[in-house]
Interface confidence: medium
């Protein structure tokens, strides 16, 4: 089965610095997304060999790519505190496959010593299963997708 190897698991960087996230697969992709999952899910980039990459407006001008869609390194520049979060590679194949995630901790320079990554990779439980019913995504992706909130969460 297709897998996505993602590195690093976690990185701590000061405001204004850059970070590299690498997404590697065994090939056979249509393309790859980098997504930020959480309370406000966000597609960061979509990359496909031979196609102009699509970048979220929040990151426009701050993203570089190297490699190919099978072994892609995404560099995010001029990081801001608000960029802190877990970034997950998603390979688009016949079924959608997710990487393990990269936790990016952006810190004020003087406080960098207080916020350190542990050696452990992000736990799968950070990305709970999706809902059941007609909205169920591909079963192969189920363990990697967060729950959509109930309608009662509407403002």
């Amino acid at each position: 089965a297709q897998e996505v190897q993602q590195s690093p698991h976690c990185t701590t960087v000061p405001v204004g610095a850059s970070v590299n996230i690498t997404c590697s697969t065994s090939g056979g992709l249509r393309g790859i997304y980098l997504r930020q999952l959480g309370p406000q899910p966000q597609d960061i980039i979509y990359y496909e060999d031979g196609v102009v990459p699509t970048t979220d407006r929040r990151f426009r001008g701050r993203i570089d790519f190297s490699g190919s869609q099978d072994n892609l390194t995404i560099t995010m520049h001029r990081l801001q505190l608000s960029d802190t979060g877990t970034y997950t590679c998603q390979a688009i194949t016949e079924v959608n496959v997710y990487g393990s995630g990269t936790l990016v901790l952006v810190t004020e320079e003087q406080s960098q010593g207080w916020h350190r990554c542990s050696d452990a990779p992000p736990r799968a439980s950070a990305l709970p299963a999706p809902p059941t019913g007609s909205a169920l995504p591909d079963p192969q992706t189920a363990s990697a997708l967060p729950d959509p909130p109930a309608a009662s969460a509407l403002p």
Partner: nanobody
Framework: QVQLQESGGGLVQPGGSLRLSCTAS????????IGWFRQAPGKEREFVST????????YYADSVKGRFTISRDNAKNTVYLEMNSLKPEDTAVYYC???????????????WGKGTQVTVSS
């Protein structure tokens, strides 16, 4: 009960403009990519545009690029399709669809609206 309701269709002259709305109920729109599709009489349903859950990424069919603009207001649970420089070949029923954490370029659509008719004719 998830529902998507399209509105804003109608009859417009060539070169005119329309703004379609897609209002969602029964889901929190901020977790869903939204797509617009259209189906002309006797033709297959075709892709028009998609927008990411956050609204920061958009994707368009070549046939509408530069004329149509997709946008969203998650606070109002509504997605818009602004259509300018309309042509007779844009005549179709326009549908919106929602997909949980969906992909812009590989959009399937978990939930679909019933459509709104757009007719471009002089």
């Amino acid at each position: 009960q998830v529902q998507l309701q399209e509105s804003g269709g109608g009859l417009v002259q060539p070169g005119g403009s329309l703004r379609l709305s897609c209002t969602a109920s029964g889901l929190t729109l901020g977790y869903y990519a939204i797509g617009w599709f259209r189906q002309a009489p006797g033709k297959e349903r075709e892709f028009v545009s998609t927008i990411s859950a956050s609204g920061g990424m958009t994707y368009y069919a070549d046939s509408v690029k530069g004329r149509f603009t997709i946008s969203r207001d998650n606070a109002k649970n509504t997605v818009y399709l602004e259509m300018n420089s309309l042509k007779p070949e844009d005549t179709a029923v326009y549908y919106c669809a929602a997909e949980y954490l969906g992909n812009l370029r590989h959009f399937r659509g978990d939930h679909w609206g019933k459509g709104t008719q757009v007719t471009v004719s002089s």
